[in-house]
Amino acid sequence: LCQGSNYSTCASCPSCPDRWMKYGNHCYYFSVEEKDWNSSLEFCLARDSHLLVITDNQEMSLLQVFLSEAFCWIGLRNNSGWRWEDGSPLNFSRISSNSFVQTCGAINKNGLQASSCEVPLHWVCKKCPFADQALF
């Protein structure tokens, strides 16, 4: 299993759990059901993963290939500025918002979108693969 921070970069990834997709050096889980943002976060944490934290535009573009018009929760929140769940600021992409109550972040094939946090959406978890060491 991965050692250290959930948010660290993984080295070469031998395998991912069932129903998880391997992409690059990480495993991704695209949910079938829908939950609110907090429940989605808890789902990921319970599986030694975290709600998707996107590191750069390249990763975002690659993941969007697997997305539709439907929005998915990701590990992004607006708390005096948009920040990822690892504490880093959102600085490589813009997020669309139409209201002050939309403080949780979602993604679809068109980009990032703010949403009110209680609405049920699909979600994406991200984790290191099995038998791997985290790079710091």
């Epitope: 139409n98 209201s99 109550v101 403080t103 209680e118 959406l121």
Partner: antibody
Framework: EVQLVESGGGLVKPGGSLKLSCAAS????????MSWVRQTPAKRLEWVAT????????FYPDSLKGRFTISRDNAKNTLYLQMSSLRSEDTAMYYC???????????????WGQGTSVTVSS | DIQMTQSPSSLSASLGERVSLTCRAS??????LNWLQQEPDGTIKRLIY???SLDSGVPKRFSGSRSGSDYSLTISSLESEDFVDYYC?????????FGSGTKLELK
Amino acid sequence: EVQLVESGGGLVKPGGSLKLSCAASGFTFSNYYMSWVRQTPAKRLEWVATISGGGGYTFYPDSLKGRFTISRDNAKNTLYLQMSSLRSEDTAMYYCARDQDYGTIYYAMDYWGQGTSVTVSS
Amino acid sequence: DIQMTQSPSSLSASLGERVSLTCRASQDIGSSLNWLQQEPDGTIKRLIYATSSLDSGVPKRFSGSRSGSDYSLTISSLESEDFVDYYCLQYAGSPPTFGSGTKLELK
């Protein structure tokens, strides 16, 4: 028919407390965000607070944080505003309003109550 | 805070006249703007939401539009019940803020 009926207003001394209620009917209350807005004697409208449908998320202007608390009882279809440490500048007509939330789309304050008057004076 | 500068503060007009009220936003608010109507008894009603969408039951003589940071409410032909107060509301930024109001008076 959507109806919002505020109550609980009145005359209160500076430093005192008051709890306003807003009884909602004609729609599925728990599906909607709700807000409180006040109108000063000078006719200026000011946002006071907003709460999510499930009650898990609340929003306030910095100037009122800590003194005012918005809450709701979805079983009773009622919205509340607890006001404490009241000041003369809190004197206003207080309105509750319904907000339409569709997650990634949000439309503010589509229906308003008739208001309840709060006067803070010694 | 986002400032909403509403003009004019009062407007005298005649029945059947076309009038426009404007709100200027100090920051980008996209289309997150409502127009509200307030009767003399205090009753508040939303007329326009999301800049240009007409609420159900609102007469078609009311319309909303945007040009850059300027948002307008236009009444194409004034009727007697239109001579009341109007406010804009932006809800994109926190806190939501209102214009200072326009009093529409019969000339």
